[in-house]
Interface confidence: low
C-alpha cells in the first residue's frame, strides 16, 4: 500500500480535517472542568481526574488508554503544624509571623485541600539568625556578595527574590554559600506589571499571593529514591540520606506583604547597584542583620513539611499507527497542579484533551496515522518531572529504539502577545512551515499567518525575517525524552511581550489565584490563543506521525552547531594566554562541525531524491533522521550529571529552565580563573572539547550513506 492509501485520504486533507475539528469552545469547557478543585500530585482528587481522563479518551476513540502508577517521593506541609517565618526579639518572642495561607479568591472560600504555600522537599528545621538579602540568589549574585562585598552568608538565613532562574538553583547556591535557611519571595518588580490591577481585578499578584514550587536539584534523575530506574513495586529505594537532589536547609516562600516586613528592617551593607533593588518601599540593604534599633532581632524559620513515598498515576493513550506502528510520536503534558492549575497545567491539559478528541473523530471516520501516537497525562511534574521520567525510565528500551518525537504540552499560555517555541533544530522547519499555514489570532494580524505575527513580534536575533526559536532547557516533562534519551522534542505556547514585561513567568504562577477565571477574564476570553496553541501542538504531532518522510531537517542542526561552536570558542578566548599556555584548540571541533554540515547537506539531497515508494529505503532514511538526535547522546553523561546526556544541549548548571549549548565545555570554562589548579581545569576544557568533537563527528557519520 502507498502511504496515502494506508491513511485513506490525502495528507493535506487529513491535516485540514484535524485542524478544523479543534474548537475553542471545547478547550474552554475542558479547562473549566479541570480547574474546579485542586489536583495536587499524590492526592485522591488527582487520581480521580486521571480516571476521568482515561474514560474520556476512550470515549474519544483511542485504541487503548491505561493508567501507569509509580510510588515516588513527594513532599507536603504538615496539616496540623504549619510552616511559617518569624521575627523574634532578644527574648525569643515572635513579634511577627508570616501568613499561613493565601487568602482564597472569591468563590473558592469553601474549597478544601488547598495546599498552603510551601517549598516542596524542604527539610524540616527551625533555623534562626541574621538575614542576608541575596537578590535573585543567582551564581553571579553570590559572586558579588562574597567576592566583591566580602559578605559571608555562612550561618545566615538568606532571603532571595523569585525570578530569573529556577528556584532549585537559588537554594543550591545558598547552600553552597553556607546559609542555614532560604526565604523566597515575589518582588512586585518581577511579579507586578505596571498599570495592571491585582487579582481578582487584574492578572497581577496580590501582596498575599505566594509562588509554590519544588526546590530540588535532580539533574534529570526523576524520583529521588530510584534514580535511573522506575519507581515500581520491586524497585530498590535509596534511604533519604542518599536521595538525589534534596535540599539540606529549610526553605519557605512568602508574598511581598510579608517580605516587606522582613526587608524593611534590613541593615548592614547597601545594595551594590540598582539591579539589586526591587519595587518595595524598603532600602534593599544586603545585611547581614537588621539595622540600628532592630539589631537584636533575628529571623526564625519554622518548617515542618514531610517527604513521603506516594503513588502517582500517568494516563497513557494509544492511537496505533497504520504503517509504522513501532514508531512513536508522543504528545505529553502534566495533569497535577499546585492548586487549581488555571494556567499551569490545565490550560495545556485542556488543549491535549481537544487534540485527542479531534484525532479520535478522524479515527472514527476510518483514518489512522502512519505512525503510532502516544498521548500522556503526566503526574507529579510539579514535584520534579516525576511521572514522565518514571514512565520513560520504565520504557527506555522501547523509546530509544522507537521514539520519533516528543511534543510537550504544559501551560498553553503565559501571556497573550505572541507564540513562543523551544525545540530541537530538527523541528525548526516543521514549525516554520506549520505556522505559515495557520492563521494568526493576534489583533492587527487578521488574515495574516501565525508565522508573520510571530516573526514580527519575536524576531530571531540571528536570522532576520525569521521568528525566534529557543533552546530546550528543562523544568518540564520533555526533559527525560530530550536530555536523557535523545528523542527530538519541542514545545510551544503563547507568551508575553518580553521587551515590555520584565516580570518573571506570569505574576500568578503557582499561586491560589491561578484559576479558570484568571484565564477567562484576563488572558484569553475567546480562547483563541488556546486554539492557536492547539493547532501548533496538534499540527506538529500530526505531521510527525503522518508525513511519509519525517519532517526533520538535519541542516538546521548544522547551522546551530556552528553557532554554538563559535559561541563557546569566544568564551574560551577571554583567556587567550591560558589557551596558549595549555595548548587549547577548538580546531577539531570546528572540523567536526564542518564535516557535519557537509554530510547533512548530502543527506538532504538524498532525502529529496530517493524513491519514496521503496519501503525499505524510506524506512532507512527515516531511521537516519530519527536516530540523529540519539547520536548526540553520550552514554556517560555530563560531569556529575549522568542523566543529562545530550552533548549539544543541557539545562544550564546555573538555571535549570535555560538551555546551554556545548554544556560540557561551557561548565569546564565557567569561572575558570578562580580554579585552584589551572592546569587541571584547562585539561578538563580540552577533554570536553574532545568529547564534543567526537560526538558531532559521530552524529555526522550516522547521516552518511549506509553503504
Amino acid at each position: 500500500k502507498s502511504s496515502s492509501e494506508a491513511t485513506n485520504i490525502t495528507p493535506k486533507h487529513n491535516m485540514k480535517a484535524f485542524l478544523d475539528e479543534l474548537k475553542a469552545e471545547n478547550i474552554k469547557k475542558f479547562l473549566h472542568n479541570f480547574t474546579q478543585i485542586p489536583h495536587l500530585a499524590g492526592t485522591e482528587q488527582n487520581f480521580q481526574l486521571a480516571k476521568q481522563i482515561q474514560s474520556q479518551w476512550k470515549e474519544f476513540g483511542l485504541d487503548s488508554v491505561e493508567l501507569t502508577h509509580y510510588d515516588v517521593l513527594l513532599s507536603y506541609p504538615n496539616k496540623t503544624h504549619p510552616n511559617y517565618i518569624s521575627i523574634i526579639n532578644e527574648d525569643g518572642n515572635e513579634i511577627f509571623n508570616t501568613s499561613l495561607f493565601e487568602p482564597p479568591p472569591a468563590g473558592y472560600e469553601n474549597v478544601s485541600d488547598i495546599v498552603p504555600p510551601f517549598s516542596a522537599f524542604s527539610p524540616q528545621g527551625m533555623p534562626e539568625g541574621d538575614l542576608v538579602y541575596v537578590n535573585y540568589a543567582r551564581t553571579e549574585d553570590f559572586f558579588k556578595l562574597e567576592r566583591d562585598m566580602k559578605i559571608n552568608c555562612s550561618g545566615k538565613i538568606v532571603i532571595a527574590r523569585y525570578g530569573k532562574v529556577f528556584r532549585g538553583n537559588k537554594v543550591k547556591n545558598a547552600q553552597l554559600a553556607g546559609a542555614t535557611g532560604v526565604i523566597l519571595y515575589s518582588d512586585p518588580d518581577d511579579y507586578f506589571a505596571p498599570g495592571v490591577k491585582s487579582y481578582p481585578d487584574g492578572w497581577n499578584l496580590p501582596g498575599g499571593g505566594v509562588q509554590r514550587g519544588n526546590i530540588l536539584n535532580l539533574n534529570g534523575a526523576g524520583d529521588p529514591l530510584t534514580p535511573g530506574y522506575p519507581a515500581n513495586e520491586y524497585a530498590y529505594r535509596r534511604g533519604m540520606a542518599e536521595a538525589v537532589g534534596l535540599p539540606s536547609i529549610p526553605v519557605h516562600p512568602i508574598g511581598y506583604y510579608d517580605a516587606q516586613k522582613l526587608l524593611e528592617k534590613m541593615g548592614g551593607s547597601a545594595s551594590p547597584d540598582s539591579s539589586w533593588r526591587g519595587s518595595l518601599k524598603v532600602p534593599y540593604n544586603v545585611g547581614p542583620g537588621f539595622t540600628g534599633n532592630f539589631s537584636t532581632q533575628k529571623v526564625k524559620m519554622h518548617i515542618h513539611s514531610t517527604s513521603e513515598v506516594t503513588r502517582i498515576y500517568n494516563v497513557i493513550g494509544t492511537l496505533r499507527g497504520a504503517v509504522e506502528p513501532d514508531r512513536y510520536v508522543i504528545l505529553g503534558g502534566h495533569r497535577d497542579s499546585w492548586v487549581f492549575g488555571g494556567i499551569d497545567p490545565q490550560s495545556g491539559a485542556a488543549v491535549v484533551h481537544e487534540i485527542v478528541r479531534s484525532f479520535g473523530m478522524l479515527k472514527k471516520e476510518g483514518w489512522r496515522p502512519r505512525r503510532t501516537i502516544l498521548f500522556a497525562s503526566w503526574d507529579a511534574e510539579e514535584f520534579g518531572l516525576l511521572g514522565s521520567t518514571e514512565w520513560a525510565e520504565e520504557n527506555s528500551r522501547l523509546l530509544q529504539e522507537r521514539g520519533v518525537a516528543y511534543i510537550n504540552a504544559d501551560s498553553s499560555i503565559e501571556g497573550n502577545y505572541t507564540l513562543r517555541v523551544d525545540c530541537t533544530p530538527l523541528m525548526y522547519s516543521l514549525v516554520y512551515n506549520l505556522t505559515k499555514e495557520l492563521e494568526s489570532p493576534d489583533e492587527g494580524f487578521e488574515g495574516k499567518s501565525l508565522y508573520e505575527s510571530w516573526t514580527k513580534k519575536s524576531p530571531s536575533p540571528e536570522f532576520s525575517g525569521m521568528p525566534r526559536i529557543s533552546k530546550l532547557g528543562s523544568g518540564n516533562d520533555f526533559e527525560v525524552f530530550f536530555q536523557r534519551l535523545g528523542i527530538a522534542s519541542g514545545r510551544a505556547r503563547y507568551t508575553k511581550n518580553w521587551e515590555t514585561n520584565k516580570f518573571s513567568s506570569y505574576p500568578l504562577y503557582h499561586s491560589v489565584y491561578e484559576t479558570y477565571e484568571l484565564v477567562e477574564k484576563f488572558y484569553d476570553p475567546m480562547f483563541k490563543y488556546h486554539l492557536t496553541v492547539a493547532q501548533v501542538r496538534g499540527g506538529m504531532v500530526f505531521e510527525l506521525a503522518n508525513s511519509v518522510v519525517l519532517p526533520f531537517d538535519c541542516r538546521d542542526y548544522a547551522v546551530v552547531l556552528r553557532k554554538y561552536a563559535d559561541k563557546i570558542y569566544n568564551i574560551s578566548m577571554k583567556h587567550p594566554q591560558e589557551m596558549k599556555t595549555y595548548s587549547v584548540s577548538f580546531d577539531s571541533l570546528f572540523s567536526a562541525v564542518k564535516n557535519f554540515t557537509e554530510i547533512a547537506s548530502k543527506f538532504s539531497e538524498r532525502l529529496r531524491d530517493f524513491d519514496k515508494s521503496n519501503p525499505i529505503l524510506l524506512r532507512m532514511m527515516n531511521d537516519q533522521l530519527m536516530f540523529l538526535e540519539r547520536a548526540f547522546i553520550d552514554p556517560l553523561g555530563l560531569p556529575d550529571r549522568p542523566f543529562y546526556r545530550h552533548v549539544i544541549y543541557a539545562p544550564s548548571s546555573h538555571n535549570k529552565y535555560a538551555g546551554e549549548s556545548f554544556p560540557g565545555i561551557y561548565d569546564a570554562l565557567f569561572d575558570i580563573e578562580s580554579k585552584v589548579d589551572p592546569s587541571q581545569a584547562w585539561g578538563e576544557v580540552k577533554r570536553q572539547i574532545s568529547i564534543a568533537t567526537f560526538t558531532v563527528q559521530a552524529a555526522a557519520e550516522t547521516l552518511s550513506e549506509v553503504a
Epitope: 510510588d71 496539616k79 496540623t80 514531610t306 517527604s307 513521603e308 513515598v309
Partner: antibody, heavy 121, light 111 residues
Framework: EVQLVESGGGLVQPGGSLRLSCAAS????????MSWVRQAPGKGLEWVSA????????YYADSVKGRFTISRDNSKNTLYLQMNSLRAEDSAVYYC??????????????WGQGTLVTVSS | QSVLTQPPSVSAAPGQKVTISCSGS????????VSWYQQLPGTAPKLLIY???KRPSGIPDRFSGSKSGTSATLGITGLQTGDEADYYC???????????FGTGTKVTVLG
C-alpha cells in the same frame, strides 16, 4: 478526641512471638507516623520502631532490628508490632504513640495507655 | 544505652524552680528539635514541650524549654506536688536514623 488503645500484650517464653495492636481514632490515621515506645519495669523510655504516614517507611532501634516488624492498616486505623525471637530484655510496657508532625518520629503528641509484655520462662 | 544524658534526679521545695538538662550531640540535639515528656507514676507519658520551646495547649506556662548547641533544658517554675514525675527529653538522631530518649530525670518536691 484522639485515642490510642494497645492490645496483644501478655506472657511469652523467650524465643516466642507476640503481635501487638494499636487501635487509633479521633484523627486522620494515615497522615501520621506512628511509633512504638517501650518501658521496662523501673526503667526509662526506649523508642522501638516507627512507620511513616502514607508511605509506610519503617525505622527500628538497633536493639530490635531483624526481630520486630512494624506495620499499619490504614483502612482499619490500626498499628501493629510483630515481635519475634523475644528475649527477657524485651519485657516492658509497650506504648503506641502518634507523631505530631509526620513522616519520621519528631515528637509524640498522643500516647496509648500501654500494654505489658513479659518474656519469661 | 541512651545517647541523651539527663541527671537522674532533681528536687526542690514547692514554689521553687528546677531545671533539667539534656545533653546530646550534633547528630541529635544539635540539628533536630527537642521535645519533653512528663510521666506521672503509673501513667503513660505526656507531651510537655515540643520544638525545643513550644507548649501544647493545656500545658501551663510554668513549664518552659530551651535549646543551645547540643544541649536542651526543661524549666519548671512554681513547683507543685503534682509535678512529681519522671521527665524525659527526646529527639531524632540523624546518624542513627532513630528516635532517642534521655535517661530520664525524677523530680521530687521536697517537704
Amino acid at each position: 478526641e484522639v485515642q490510642l488503645v494497645e492490645s496483644g500484650g501478655g506472657l511469652v517464653q523467650p524465643g516466642g512471638s507476640l503481635r501487638l495492636s494499636c487501635a487509633a481514632s479521633g484523627f486522620t490515621f494515615s497522615s501520621y507516623a506512628m511509633s512504638w515506645v517501650r518501658q521496662a519495669p523501673g526503667k526509662g523510655l526506649e523508642w522501638v520502631s516507627a512507620i511513616s504516614g502514607g508511605s509506610g517507611s519503617t525505622y527500628y532501634a538497633d536493639s530490635v532490628k531483624g526481630r520486630f516488624t512494624i506495620s499499619r492498616d490504614n483502612s482499619k486505623n490500626t498499628l501493629y508490632l510483630q515481635m519475634n525471637s523475644l528475649r527477657a530484655e524485651d519485657s516492658a510496657v509497650y506504648y503506641c504513640a502518634k507523631d505530631g508532625v509526620g513522616a519520621t518520629p519528631y515528637y509524640f503528641d498522643y500516647w496509648g495507655q500501654g500494654t505489658l509484655v513479659t518474656v519469661s520462662s | 544505652q541512651s545517647v541523651l544524658t539527663q541527671p537522674p534526679s532533681v528536687s526542690a521545695a514547692p514554689g521553687q524552680k528546677v531545671t533539667i538538662s539534656c545533653s546530646g550531640s550534633s547528630s541529635n540535639i544539635g540539628n533536630n528539635y527537642v521535645s519533653w515528656y512528663q510521666q506521672l507514676p503509673g501513667t503513660a507519658p505526656k507531651l510537655l514541650i515540643y520544638d525545643n520551646n513550644k507548649r501544647p495547649s493545656g500545658i501551663p506556662d510554668r513549664f518552659s524549654g530551651s535549646k543551645s548547641g547540643t544541649s536542651a533544658t526543661l524549666g519548671i517554675t512554681g513547683l507543685q506536688t503534682g509535678d512529681e514525675a519522671d521527665y524525659y527529653c527526646g529527639t531524632w538522631d540523624s546518624s542513627l536514623s532513630a528516635y532517642v530518649f534521655g535517661t530520664g530525670t525524677k523530680v521530687t518536691v521536697l517537704g
